[in-house]
């Protein structure tokens, strides 16, 4: 997913809606305007605000890289929701590419887990029922296995 | 002429409370948003928090629960009450007219506060 | 909370020389930041805001640029006047976010 970025707020455009602040806050879907007077809204997939602030632009909406898929439409108050694609996954310490998923398991382990769009296949030793590391085994090693389907 | 003017500092013991005032000419601060920022000797500015011009107030972390942003239209005063005072409170308090998208634009000349025992 | 990181804290530069200050924000502010200018036991006063913008009475050497999370005061011929300490602050979201002020820089002349 691209870096969330902030768009420059812009004059209100006459199908923008607009309001009073309330306690000097205007609601989801909106922004202050530039001299705190008034609320204006986002624009529907282009930008949005998911609490209540003061913020003078809404932030810009996030594009799903090629790679992914959207599952959810960014509108004035949610974020676009993007997912990584069938056999590739997002790992939480590199949220900013999708990885693809392993096709097996090393030699002496056993499937466990399936490839999902946050997770890559979860291997474990046959005997002890230990997990695997994660790295990435030696092609002589694998065991292939169609996603889905337990290694044998 | 618009101006701030902020008076209610001195020496003060530690644990004590003292009110600070911001006197406004030239314009009503009821109808800006209004600042108080703080500057401890030989440091950098600091802010403390703000009331908007409906009478909300919302504060730095570091002020919670001890500050107090109120103003008093009919004086057009702003004020900071400051409780349980600290010597890490020292400093000169300044107040001063915040204008959302312009900035701080107006400011006062502060008043010095001392906590000492 | 948004962070304010300014560089460098202190400057040594001559009279006539080109001076840069820069802000970086943690988190993007658009272009709504200002830049103030304090002397030794005075109060603050704005240079510029919304990034670019001089402030009434401002002399034209000053100036501001940057958007997203980096800014940068340029003074283009540094006066003698010119010493003092500049600070940057955020203009957006003050009551979500806070408004801290940068660390400041301290321009000397040499």
């Known amino acids: 997913i691209t870096q969330q970025d902030l768009a420059p707020q812009q004059r209100a455009a006459p199908q923008q809606k607009r309001s009073s602040p309330s306690e000097g806050l205007c609601p989801p879907g909106h922004h202050i305007s530039e001299d705190g007077r008034d609320c204006i809204s986002c624009k529907y997939g282009q930008d949005y605000s998911t609490h209540w602030n003061d913020l003078l632009f809404c932030l810009r909406c996030t594009r799903c890289d090629s790679g992914e898929v959207e599952l959810s439409p960014c509108t004035t108050t949610r974020n676009t929701v993007c997912q990584c694609e069938e056999g590739t996954f997002r790992e939480e310490d590199s949220p900013e590419m999708c990885r693809k998923c392993r096709t097996g398991c090393p030699r002496g382990m056993v499937k466990v887990g399936d490839c999902t769009p946050w997770s890559d296949i979860e291997c474990v030793h046959k005997e002890s029922g230990t997990k695997h590391s994660g790295e990435v085994p030696a092609v002589e090693e694998t065991v292939t296995s169609s996603p889905g389907t337990p290694a044998s | 002429e618009v101006q701030l003017v902020e008076t209610g500092g001195g020496l003060i013991q530690p644990g004590g409370s003292l009110r600070l005032s911001c006197a406004a000419s030239?314009?009503?601060?009821?109808?800006?948003?209004m600042i108080w920022v703080r500057q401890a000797p030989g440091k950098g500015l600091e802010y403390i928090g703000f009331?908007?011009?409906?009478?909300?107030?919302y504060y730095a972390d570091s002020a919670k629960g001890r500050f107090t942003i109120s103003r008093d239209n009919s004086k057009n005063t702003l004020y900071l009450q400051m409780n349980s005072l600290r010597a890490e409170d020292t400093a000169v308090y300044y107040c001063?007219?915040?204008?959302?998208?312009?900035?701080?634009?107006?400011w006062g000349r502060g008043t010095l506060v001392t906590v000492s025992s | 909370d948004i962070q304010m990181t300014q560089s460098p804290s202190s400057l040594s530069a001559s009279v006539g020389d080109r001076v840069t200050i820069t802000c970086r924000a943690s988190?993007?502010?658009?272009?709504?930041l200002s830049w103030y200018q304090q002397k030794p036991g005075k109060a603050p006063k704005r240079l510029i805001y919304?990034?670019?913008t001089l402030a009434s009475g401002v002399p034209s050497r000053f100036s501001g640029s940057g958007s997203g999370t980096d800014f940068t005061l340029t003074i283009s011929s540094l006066q003698p006047e010119d010493a003092a300490t500049y600070y940057c602050?955020?203009?957006?979201?003050?009551?979500?976010?806070?408004?801290?002020f940068g660390g400041g820089t301290k321009v000397e002349i040499k």
């Open positions: 988190q993007s502010i658009s272009t709504y």
């Open positions: 009331i908007t011009s409906d009478g909300s107030t």
């Open positions: 001063a007219r915040y204008t959302y998208s312009d900035g701080t634009d107006l």
């Open positions: 602050q955020p203009n957006s979201g003050i009551a979500t976010y806070g408004a801290a």
């Open positions: 030239g314009f009503t601060v009821s109808r800006y948003a």
């Open positions: 919304k990034a670019s």
